[in-house]
């Protein structure tokens, strides 16, 4: 006489909310005589899912006709799956007994896990801007997916990054999971137009990963390079001082002219020119009348960029000895 085997071919069944799930179970022998019942879980707290003989199971239907004498297929279909249906299902053979049937053999179980797509990844950058050569962190979050297995990759301008840490929560069994990953990116001066991308791959996405992006322009501050030039003296003893502020980002920049330490003009950068790399240039001019100067003039240009400490660049305008003589004569 052949020994009874309970065959549950699927170890794992992935089902989306609202779908129907078929739990397969076949037996290899009609003996011993007795019913096959379905349970979720094991031990004394297990939940009865289907009993052909008694009870009311409105969402459960059998795949084949259990009333047929030689039926060996005890598969069931559960309709309108909800997150509460997740768990491991066992088909269990009972031997006919008196006064009660006795459990004879259990199938290996089929785990029903909810198949849920991850939400679109959301990438957020650092709270404050950083300058080139510094490292900034970007965080990517996605939630609501099941099963737990998920793959997350980071890219900068299409090139894969390796410096990141990823966590999937919770660690144990759950109806759905969330993922959080933090990537560290070293900023470069040309990164104003760069982009980081977080890519999430999951069984529910059929090989078409979800992506979230962030622009490095939100995270970078490129400090300006400063250049002061003095145009040759013009008629009427005037000197044109040109102050060039180059390759800065973002565009909020304030410039203050000081003559011998006294503020003579404050400007906020307005008519900027944008470079192809996304940084900006700005030029400011100051016309200084040297005819009424008796001493050398120290011209200082103070640049305050994006709320940072001001950077100073000074230029000494030398007044000729002849002018100094004239000035001192005029004071007598």
């Amino acid at each position: 006489e052949e020994e009874l085997q309970m065959i549950q071919p699927e170890k794992l069944l992935l089902v989306a909310v609202g779908e129907s799930a078929t739990l397969n179970c076949t037996v290899t022998s009609l003996l011993p005589v007795g019913p096959v019942l379905w349970f979720r879980g094991v031990g004394p707290g297990r939940e009865l899912i289907y009993n052909q003989k008694e009870g009311h199971f409105p969402r459960v239907t059998t795949v084949s006709d259990l009333t047929k004498r030689n039926n060996m297929d005890f598969s069931i279909r559960i309709s309108s799956i909800t997150p509460a249906d997740a768990g491991t299902y066992y088909c269990v053979k009972f031997r006919k007994g008196s006064p009660e049937n006795v459990e004879f053999k259990s199938g290996p179980g089929t785990e029903m896990a909810l198949r849920a797509k991850p939400s679109a990844p959301v990438v957020s950058g650092p709270a404050a801007r950083a300058t080139p050569e510094h490292t900034v962190s970007f965080t990517c979050k996605s939630h609501g997916f099941s099963p737990r297995d998920i793959t997350l990759k980071w890219f900068k301008n299409g090139n894969e990054l390796s410096d990141f840490q990823t966590n999937v929560d919770p660690a144990g069994q759950s109806v759905s999971y969330s993922i959080r990953s933090t990537a560290r990116v070293v900023l470069a001066p040309w990164d104003v137009r760069s982009q980081v991308t977080c890519e999430v791959a999951h069984v529910t996405l059929q090989g078409d990963p979800l992506r979230g992006t962030a622009n490095l322009s939100e995270a970078i501050r490129v400090p300006p390079t400063l250049e002061v030039t003095q145009q040759p003296m013009r008629a009427g003893n005037q000197v044109n001082i040109t102050y060039q502020v180059r390759n800065f980002y973002p565009q909020n920049l304030q410039l203050t002219w000081l003559e011998n330490g006294n503020v003579c003009r404050t400007e906020t950068a307005s008519t900027l020119t944008e470079n192809k790399d996304g940084t900006y240039n700005w030029t400011s001019w100051l016309l200084v009348n040297t005819s009424d100067q008796r001493d050398d003039v120290v011209l200082t240009c103070q640049v305050k960029h994006d709320g940072q400490l001001a950077v100073n660049k000074s230029l000494v305008l030398e007044v000729s000895a002849h002018q100094k003589d004239q000035s001192s004569d005029a004071t007598h």
Partner: antibody, heavy 126, light 107 residues
Framework: QVQLVQSGAEVKKPGASVKVSCKAS????????INWVRQAPGQGLEWMGW????????GYAQKLQGRVTMTRDTSTSTVYMELSSLRSEDTAVYYC???????????????????WGQGTLVTVSS | DIQMTQSPSSLSASVGDRVTITCRAS??????LGWYQQKPGKAPKLLIY???NLQSGVPSRFSGSGSGTDFTLTISSLQPEDFATYYC?????????FGGGTKVEIK
């Protein structure tokens, strides 16, 4: 798939202006710079300038400075190239073309052109 | 402006031939060079970027080499659909400049 579709052929009189459109689809419009290149009949390729559709920033060939203007409409993913004070030597096929990548590298912010429009013939004749 | 000089300006070849086109820049342009194919009445098509990288979808019979000022486009075994005009283009500095073109004709 990436596509750049240009407006139809134009015939203009010397001194007039022409505005050619280039509608982009199949990619993130604001991410990649658009360049304009022209080709006079039987001649080689001449670069006219570039535009950043995100910021509206432009860079033009010195030769055309003051006569060429590039603009964009992000709501329709369209870039426009307007050439004014037309002369007979402006007769050419005008192409819009997308730069291959939308970012800068350590060495350059300029890139080869991987997708091109079908071209727009502009004839300048009195 | 950087001048790009292509040679030859035209050549005749047969199907199966190995064809080489050269391009010289008037100053060093690192590897910032692209090669394009243009057929009559059509827009140019990018074949090679960064001097030696094959653009996606381009047959492997096309290859590029060179750095600095001297560059080469090679078609290892010429096919009927390869008869066209080929242009080199530098993307080292503005203005972007193209070579004068090389017309590959059927012998």
């Amino acid at each position: 798939q990436v596509q750049l579709v240009q407006s139809g052929a134009e015939v203009k009189k010397p001194g007039a202006s022409v505005k050619v459109s280039c509608k982009a689809s199949g990619y993130t419009f604001t991410r990649y710079d658009i360049n304009w290149v022209r080709q006079a009949p039987g001649q080689g390729l001449e670069w006219m300038g570039w535009m950043n559709p995100n910021s509206g920033n432009t860079g033009y060939a010195q030769k055309l400075q003051g006569r060429v203007t590039m603009t964009r409409d992000t709501s329709t993913s369209t870039v426009y190239m307007e050439l004014s004070s037309l002369r007979s030597e402006d007769t050419a096929v005008y192409y819009c073309a997308r730069e291959r990548v939308g970012y800068c590298s350590s060495t350059s912010c300029l890139h080869p052109l991987d997708y091109w429009g079908q071209g727009t013939l502009v004839t300048v004749s009195s | 402006d950087i001048q790009m000089t292509q040679s030859p300006s035209s050549l005749s070849a047969s199907v199966g031939d190995r064809v080489t086109i050269t391009c010289r820049a008037s100053q060093g342009i690192r590897n910032d060079l692209g090669w394009y194919q243009q057929k009559p009445g059509k827009a140019p098509k990018l074949l090679i970027y960064s001097a030696s990288n094959l653009q996606s979808g381009v047959p492997s019979r096309f290859s590029g080499s060179g750095s600095g000022t001297d560059f080469t486009l090679t078609i290892s075994s010429l096919q009927p659909e390869d008869f066209a005009t080929y242009y080199c283009q530098q993307s080292y500095d503005v203005p972007l400049t193209f070579g004068g073109g090389t017309k590959v004709e059927i012998k």
